[in-house]
């Protein structure tokens, strides 16, 4: 059994999240994940999900009773999602920490927008664009 | 020339983001994107970048002087990043809108954590896990 399972069960107790009524009104993440089979689509969704959990864990970082559980799960997320690659995790963290209300950040974001857009389509840089990315303009 | 270019130039004027000093202290997104060549890694990063821009544009949605530019760029992002797939965009939007301080959302997130974790590794569901994903435990 993966180490996160025991610790997630501990968090369920802490958050009173084990009851069946928690599942009322549908799921947050599971239903969405079920819709996407392509690896790149899954990464788009999982990126948001992982950042949500990191934010959630940050809010409870000073709570001693669940600290070990949170640390274990974060470590396991780093292994599974970032493949233990610290650079990947650090870059991800930087992106999630930018403040959208910071004027300097806003100016930088707009300054970089054209280049960011140019790279958005899959394989835009290599020219090996899938049929799905073929865009024609008059 | 893609349509977003002209509109992004308009936003640069509005945000006073055309000056060379904007690039001081490094980039927000471009340096990070340069680090990642694998499509799935790029999607992890671009997912955060696109959600940043959508948040930024939301903050300026009532500003008439840039409304056309913002709408054009959002449309272009939807075509390029979500391949015009509204279901993909809608699922993404749902994920970005969950509030990490909402108690019901917290409970649901913890309730779903074990299943979310089980799906985090690439091809975890199919058993076709790449060598980089092979995790051994004693």
């Amino acid at each position: 059994q993966d180490p996160y399972v025991k610790e997630a069960e501990n968090l369920k107790k802490y958050f009173n999240a084990g009851h069946s009524d928690v599942a009322d009104n549908g799921t947050l993440f599971l239903g969405i994940l079920k819709n996407w089979k392509e690896e790149s689509d899954r990464k788009i969704m999982q990126s948001q999900i992982v950042s949500f959990y990191f934010k959630l864990f940050k809010n409870f970082k000073d709570d001693q009773s669940i600290q070990k559980s949170v640390e274990t799960i974060k470590e396991d997320m780093n292994v599974k999602f970032f493949n233990s690659n610290k650079k990947k995790r650090d870059d991800f963290e930087k992106l999630t920490n930018y403040s959208v209300t910071d004027l300097n950040v806003q100016r930088k974001a707009i300054h970089e927008l054209i280049q960011v857009m140019a790279e958005l389509s899959p394989a835009a840089k290599t020219g090996k664009r899938k049929r799905s990315q073929m865009l024609f303009r008059g | 020339q893609d349509p977003y270019v002209k509109e992004a130039e308009n936003l640069k004027k509005y945000f006073n983001a055309g000056h060379s000093d904007v690039a001081d202290n490094g980039t927000l997104f471009l340096g990070i994107l340069k680090n990642w060549k694998e499509e799935s890694d790029r999607k992890i990063m671009q997912s955060q970048i696109v959600s940043f821009y959508f948040k930024l544009f939301k903050n300026f949605k009532d500003d008439q002087s840039i409304q056309k530019s913002v709408e054009t760029i959002k449309e272009d992002m939807n075509v390029k990043f979500f391949n015009s797939n509204k279901k993909k965009r809608d699922d993404f939007e749902k994920l970005t809108n969950y509030s990490v301080t909402d108690l019901n959302v917290q409970r649901k997130a913890i309730h779903e954590l074990i299943q979310v974790m089980a799906e985090l590794s690439p091809a975890a569901k199919t058993g076709k896990r790449k060598r980089s994903q092979m995790l051994f435990r004693g």
Partner: antibody, heavy 124, light 112 residues
Framework: EVQLVESGGGLVKPGDSLTVSCVAS????????IHWVRQAPGKGLEWVAT????????FYSDSLRGRFTVSRDNANNSVYLHMSSLRGEDTALYYC?????????????????WGRGTLVTVSS | NFMLTQPHSVSESPGKTITISCTRG????????VQWYQQRPGGVPKIVVF?????PSGVPDRISGSIDTSTNSASLTISGLQTEDEADYYC??????????FGGGTKLTVLG
């Protein structure tokens, strides 16, 4: 009230060209993708082409790409379908259909509003 | 290919329930929204279900849409059949290029 009105259909000979038009009203035209869908007599619906709103990206059915060209004039709330090298099998009722507003995450449904169609007959 | 396969025809008596299936040949049914259109003889197609399960205003709740990932298909269900339900019904979704695709259509006959 959302309205789409097609025009320009008629009888043409095989090999000829024809442009059908669609004028829209009742919504912010430039925000919406527009689709062309056709229906041959007694047959099912077939997607022909789509043009995006402000970005004017064009998407075509693989079987028609090269012969058909879609364009739009946002200032005049108009979209056009230019058809060349027409064949008998292009005989159909051509519908102009409003798509999504891809700049708005709360956009109304795709293919919600249809015109009444314009009939194109290709015959010698 | 990306065919959406529908039965050519279905028929049932008034008051009964029918289900029209729409099976996706390639690609995953849940990754793209599915719409359903009703076309009466000589009429323009009219949307009766959009985005898998949503009903536009004015469409009675006797009509519903669903997705079944286990069969990679969508379904349109009409309960309490009425003579005015007699029409052709088309499912519609998208291919991997997000091009619009239509099913071949199903002719619904209300008997009697």
């Amino acid at each position: 009230e959302v309205q789409l009105v097609e025009s320009g259909g008629g009888l043409v000979k095989p090999g000829d060209s024809l442009t059908v038009s669609c004028v829209a009203s009742g919504f912010t035209f430039s925000n919406y993708f527009i689709h062309w869908v056709r229906q041959a007599p007694g047959k099912g619906l077939e997607w022909v082409a789509t043009i995006s709103g402000r970005t004017k990206y064009m998407f075509y059915s693989d079987s028609l790409r090269g012969r058909f060209t879609v364009s739009r004039d946002n200032a005049n709330n108009s979209v056009y379908l230019h058809m060349s090298s027409l064949r008998g099998e292009d005989t159909a009722l051509y519908y102009c259909v409003r798509g999504y507003d891809h700049s708005d995450s709360n956009s109304a449904a795709d293919l919600l509003h249809w015109g009444r169609g314009t009939l194109v007959t290709v015959s010698s | 290919n990306f065919m959406l396969t529908q039965p050519h025809s279905v028929s049932e008596s008034p008051g009964k329930t029918i289900t029209i299936s729409c099976t996706r040949g390639r690609g995953y049914i849940a990754s793209y929204y599915v719409q359903w259109y009703q076309q009466r003889p000589g009429g323009v197609p009219k949307i009766v279900v959009f985005e898998d399960t949503q009903r536009p205003s004015g469409v009675p709740d006797r009509i519903s849409g669903s997705i079944d990932t286990s069969t990679n298909s969508a379904s349109l269900t009409i309960s309490g059949l009425q003579t005015e339900d007699e029409a052709d019904y088309y499912c519609q979704s998208y291919d991997d290029a997000n091009h619009v695709i239509f099913g071949g259509g199903t002719k619904l006959t209300v008997l009697g």
